[in-house]
């Protein structure tokens, strides 16, 4: 018996808007009703919580309303977005994902997608 | 599925030891990082030491004083915590993590990484 598998891209680059989307997908040993997903970012040896959302299968994701990701589910796989990234946030976004109902509970996190934010050049002024 | 299992908690004199056990049923340790955190009164949830198949990493708060050790055959894994002093009182928590290449020392014990968790074992530091 292992750890739940869950794959992920291991690059994204972020759009000039700020906005990063990744697939998390993963492989469930039963049949699980409840699924918790949390983003993770690990930069500089620190590790914060980006967001989390804790679904029914069948449903949307719902993430707080101040939160910087939206999703949607789709059996297995998970279709992520960050929003409002900078150059700053760049760093590696890890998907966990816990299977909480019905027992037994399991975990998987995959192996990291690393974000690359470029923050774009100021328009030069216009003599117009 | 893993299922973890700690004991060992109790009430001991400051400056003395208490051996914590954790042990896995349902699968071999050998792919999990296995961690011990501990939670005081009004306090959050902090890491105290974890350990992988090569590596092993403390807080500062606890460093050489505890040891953590695992026990493959056994599949349990042990906290042995000497010169207990008044502030390490807490409810201690044994968890794991699935080993992964990206884990560094200062980061393979972060609680954000870790399920499983047990209901917790109380440790009492007092005279």
């Known amino acids: 018996c292992k750890a739940m598998h869950v794959a992920q891209p291991a690059v994204v680059l972020a759009s000039s808007r700020g906005i990063a989307s990744f697939v998390c997908e993963y492989a469930s040993p039963g049949k699980a009703t409840e699924v918790r997903v949390t983003v993770l970012r690990q930069a500089d040896s620190q590790v914060t919580e980006v967001c989390a959302a804790t679904y029914m299968m069948g449903n949307e994701l719902t993430f707080l309303d101040d939160s910087i990701c939206t999703g949607t589910s789709s059996g297995n796989q998970v279709n992520l977005t960050i929003q409002g990234l900078r150059a700053m946030d760049t760093g590696l976004y890890i998907c966990k994902v816990e299977l909480m109902y019905p027992p037994p509970y399991y975990l998987g996190i995959g192996n990291g997608t690393q974000i690359y934010v470029i923050d774009p050049e100021p328009c030069p002024d216009s003599d117009f | 599925e893993v299922q973890l299992v700690e004991s060992g908690g109790g009430l001991v004199q400051p400056g003395g030891s208490l051996r914590l056990s954790c042990a896995a049923s349902?699968?071999?340790?050998?792919?999990?990082?296995i961690g011990w955190f501990r939670q005081a009164p009004g306090k959050e949830r902090e890491t105290v030491s974890c350990?992988?198949?090569?590596?092993?990493s403390y807080a500062d708060s606890v460093k050489g004083r505890f040891t953590i050790s695992r026990d493959n055959s056994k599949n349990t894994v042990y906290l042995q915590m000497n010169s207990l002093r008044a502030e390490d009182t807490a409810v201690y928590y044994c968890?794991?993590?699935?080993?992964?290449?990206?884990?560094?020392?200062?980061?393979?014990?972060?609680?954000?990484?870790?399920?499983?968790w047990t209901q917790g074992t109380q440790v009492t530091v007092s005279s």
């Open positions: 350990i992988n198949r090569s590596r092993t």
């Open positions: 968890a794991a993590s699935p080993d992964k290449p990206f884990y560094t020392d200062q980061t393979m014990c972060n609680k954000h990484y870790y399920g499983y």
């Open positions: 349902g699968s071999t340790l050998d792919p999990f990082v």
